[in-house]
């Protein structure tokens, strides 16, 4: 019967006793930077080419006995998970292996850097189809390694890495912390985060998604027909590398941004038990388990968006946090979140010719996060319209006044320290969906975009009684681009998007009286692109 991990990543319409995905990734080459491998294992023989690249440190200890099967164990298993004949994800993908880890599974930053440079040069000398680079390794944070990953990613290579097995914030490790890399955490057959002894999978905002990573059957270097189960974020990353290979084989022109958005979009949502993660990391960690798309074609019509969290600002009074989208993505909205509730909102601002989302801490606050909503919107022309504090009783308003521009997100930013605590709520007049409304003492920022066929609508959900969390979701066929709280609702910790749902968090209701001040309204802006839908219908 099909191993649990292959069943888990297979959409229901392809489920059978045998794992037979529609496309095997035959147009894609996957580079594996790992240990040496047993290339004559029948699971991978003829599918994996061992390059002459080797850059590894000496093994530790005078008593270390170099045994070939042990030296090859990690790499052989991962090669099998990616493209193995029987237990592989992308059975058609060809692979090339580079040895950057020694027989004890240890490597160096310099060895990995030289390996990445080797791939870049190979790509220049002999350009092939789409390339995926699998980095099933994790070390301490390295600015230079992250920069090398960025360079390769910007050259059109898809990099997939393990989040790390330290039961820690993945942002503290490299290459997991590199924004351009697709970082993968590990889950088990119960869709729970993988525990490895006293440690386990890493987590946090630097993780893009999770994938099967416990009790994964794959080629064993013990013998030519041997199989073994291994666990860890390396195995999880190998699944995503395989899925990426299959997606790229079906659509070779996909950019890294498009691929990442599709991986997120087609993942299983909200299946992971977040209680396993430290409390402060739960909101930052994506609740996504990787899966193959139900069809390898025809996803182009959708408006894809993802949520990007910034690093924590730190507690100083003037501290700010910045969230950025990838180069090919549009920032369609910006929100902020603070566990203490002390923040001064957020604003979208230009930085290096691109919009970023900046959140502001407040005096006495423990720090803030900026949350960017990053979307794929071809031929988009987006701008930010700002209204300064109005000082009028009706509050501050701003709308998209340019012809053909639609509202995709609202942000508000204020200079006063504790806006809204003693203010009555300001109600937004009905029938004006193309405008943002805020406190009279806040400056309001509207994200206004023009793109072929783009249409957006505002959806609200208000609860009169105090609630710790209020949500509003976009309907099927619409994508959440903006998420904010209606001004005047007090004690709001912030707002953020989780998949297609806008979440507004408030302070613990036990500390808040049940006055009208406790009312909370979540405001979602939901968009779709008729242009993309029509384009895909023409292609089919």
């Amino acid at each position: 019967s099909i191993p649990w991990n292959l069943e888990r990543i297979t959409p229901p319409r392809y489920r059978a006793d045998e794992y037979q995905p529609p496309d095997g990734g035959s147009l894609v080459e996957v580079y594996l930077l790992d240990t040496s491998i047993q290339s004559d294992h029948r699971e991978i023989e003829g599918r994996v080419m061992v390059t002459d690249f080797e850059n590894v440190p000496e093994e530790d200890g005078t008593r270390f006995h170099r045994q070939a099967s042990k030296c090859d164990s990690h790499g052989t298993h991962l090669a099998g998970v990616v493209s193995g004949r029987d237990a592989g994800v992308a059975k058609g993908a060809s692979m090339r292996s580079l040895r950057v880890l020694n027989c004890q599974g240890k490597g160096t930053v310099s060895g990995t850097l030289i390996g990445l440079e080797f791939i870049r040069k190979s790509q220049l000398v002999q350009p092939v189809g789409p390339l995926v680079v699998l980095l099933p390794l994790a070390g301490g944070y390295s600015r230079v390694l992250n920069a090398a990953c960025q360079r390769l990613a910007r050259a059109g290579v898809v990099l997939v890495t393990a989040a790390g097995n330290f039961r820690d914030d993945a942002c503290l490790y490299s290459p997991a912390s590199a924004p351009e890399v697709i970082t993968v955490g590990a889950t088990n057959a119960q869709d729970q985060p993988v525990t490895l002894g006293t440690l386990g999978t890493n987590f946090g905002r630097c993780v893009d998604l999770f994938a099967p990573g416990e009790d994964i059957i794959g080629a064993s270097s013990d013998c030519s027909t041997c199989f073994v189960s291994q666990s860890g974020t390396s195995q999880a990353a190998a699944h995503v590398a395989g899925i990426a290979a299959m997606m790229l084989s079906a659509e070779p022109e996909l950019t890294l941004a498009e691929l990442r958005q599709r991986l997120i979009h087609f993942s299983a949502k909200d299946v992971i038990n977040e209680a396993w993660f430290p409390e402060d990391q739960r909101v930052l960690t994506p609740n996504l388990v990787a899966a193959l798309p139900p069809s390898t074609h025809g996803a182009g019509w959708q408006l894809f968006c993802r949520t990007v969290w910034s690093a924590h600002s730190g507690p100083t009074r003037m501290a700010t946090a910045v969230a950025r989208c990838a180069p090919d993505e549009e920032l369609l909205s910006c929100s902020s979140f603070s566990r203490s509730g002390k923040r001064r909102g957020e604003r979208m601002e230009a930085q290096g010719g691109k919009l970023v989302c900046r959140a502001h801490n407040a005096f006495g606050g423990e720090g803030v996060y900026a949350i960017a909503r990053c979307c794929l919107l071809p031929q988009a022309n987006c701008s930010v319209h700002t209204a300064p504090p109005a000082e009028a009783s009706m509050g501050t308003r701003v709308h998209c006044h340019q012809q053909g521009h639609v509202l995709t997100g609202c942000s508000s930013h204020w200079e006063v320290e504790d806006l809204g605590t003693h203010k009555p709520p300001v109600l937004r007049p009905r029938g004006q969906p193309n405008q943002c409304v805020g406190h009279r003492e806040a400056s309001i920022h509207a994200s206004c975009c023009h793109a072929p066929g783009l249409e957006c609508k505002v959806k609200e959900h208000g609860i009169p009684a105090p609630q710790e969390q209020v949500t509003v979701a976009c309907e099927e066929g619409w994508t959440l681009t903006g998420c904010s709280a209606l001004p005047g609702t007090s004690h709001v910790l912030g707002a953020y998007a989780v998949d297609n749902t806008c979440v507004v968090r408030s302070r613990d209701v036990s500390t808040t009286g049940s006055t009208s001040e406790g009312a909370v309204t979540a405001v979602a802006i939901c968009c779709r692109s008729r242009h993309l839908a029509q384009a895909s219908q023409e292609l089919q």
Epitope: K91, D222, C226, F227
Partner: antibody
């Protein structure tokens, strides 16, 4: 049900070519290996080689390398064993058998094809 | 190549009695990573193809009577028929499937005494 059905007995002269077949049914043919096993008259079993029909990967026993060719047509779920020039010593019963990657023992066998090479 | 040697070459046992066949491999077929012995036993009756009896040295194939059992580890293995029946008359082969080329023992012929 799961089965492997082999082509019928063959009588050939030395130097002639031959291709015998093994058709799989009742299972996903591309996801299992097919091995070929020789049994000379009154003798034991000898593994000749295998093929993975999913991508036509082959592996031969050194003693049969260059002597025979193993191939497959996954569109008709059939594996083949062929000789370009038969010898009298090729007279034997030939069996095909299937195995799976992480269950590499032969759980299903064909009924056998008797090849007789005589002048 | 891993050489598989069976003993005895032939064996005559009374009906209802125990039959024991030994198989020795020239190198270990036990692998530490999954703690499995890559050894199978097959039965071949006259005019029929071989039939799988035992795999992983001791796991009985479904449908095989429980009088057949396999044991051993590393390099030494045994197939036991606890109570020989008339239909058990056949040639029995051991096979290692861990290394290429896959190899069989020379076979042990079991007859009724």
């Amino acid at each position: 049900q799961v089965q492997l059905v082999q082509s019928g007995a063959e009588v050939k002269k030395p130097g002639e070519s031959l291709k015998i077949s093994c058709k799989g049914s009742g299972y996903s043919f591309t996801n299992y290996y097919i091995s070929w096993v020789r049994q000379m008259p009154g003798k034991g079993l000898e593994w000749m080689g295998l093929i993975y029909p999913g991508d036509s990967y082959t592996r031969y026993s050194p003693r049969f390398q260059g002597q025979v060719t193993i191939s497959a047509d996954k569109s008709i779920s059939t594996a083949y064993l062929q000789w370009s020039s038969l010898k009298a010593s090729d007279t034997a019963m030939y069996y095909c058998a299937r195995d799976h990657g992480y269950k590499p023992y032969s759980d299903i066998w064909g009924q056998g094809t008797l090849v007789t090479v005589s002048s | 190549d891993i050489v598989m040697t069976q003993s005895p070459d032939s064996l005559a046992v009374s009906l209802g009695e125990r039959a024991t066949i030994n198989c020795r491999s020239s190198q270990s077929v036990l692998y530490s990573s999954n703690n499995k012995n890559y050894l199978a036993w097959y039965q071949q009756k006259p005019g029929q193809p071989p039939k799988l009896l035992i795999y992983w040295a001791s796991t009985r194939e479904s449908g095989v009577p429980d009088r057949f059992s396999g044991s051993g580890s590393g390099t030494d293995f045994t197939l036991t028929i606890s109570s020989l029946q008339a239909e058990d008359v056949a040639v029995y082969y051991c096979q290692q499937y861990s290394s290429f080329p896959i190899t069989f023992g020379q076979g042990t012929k079991v007859e009724i005494k």
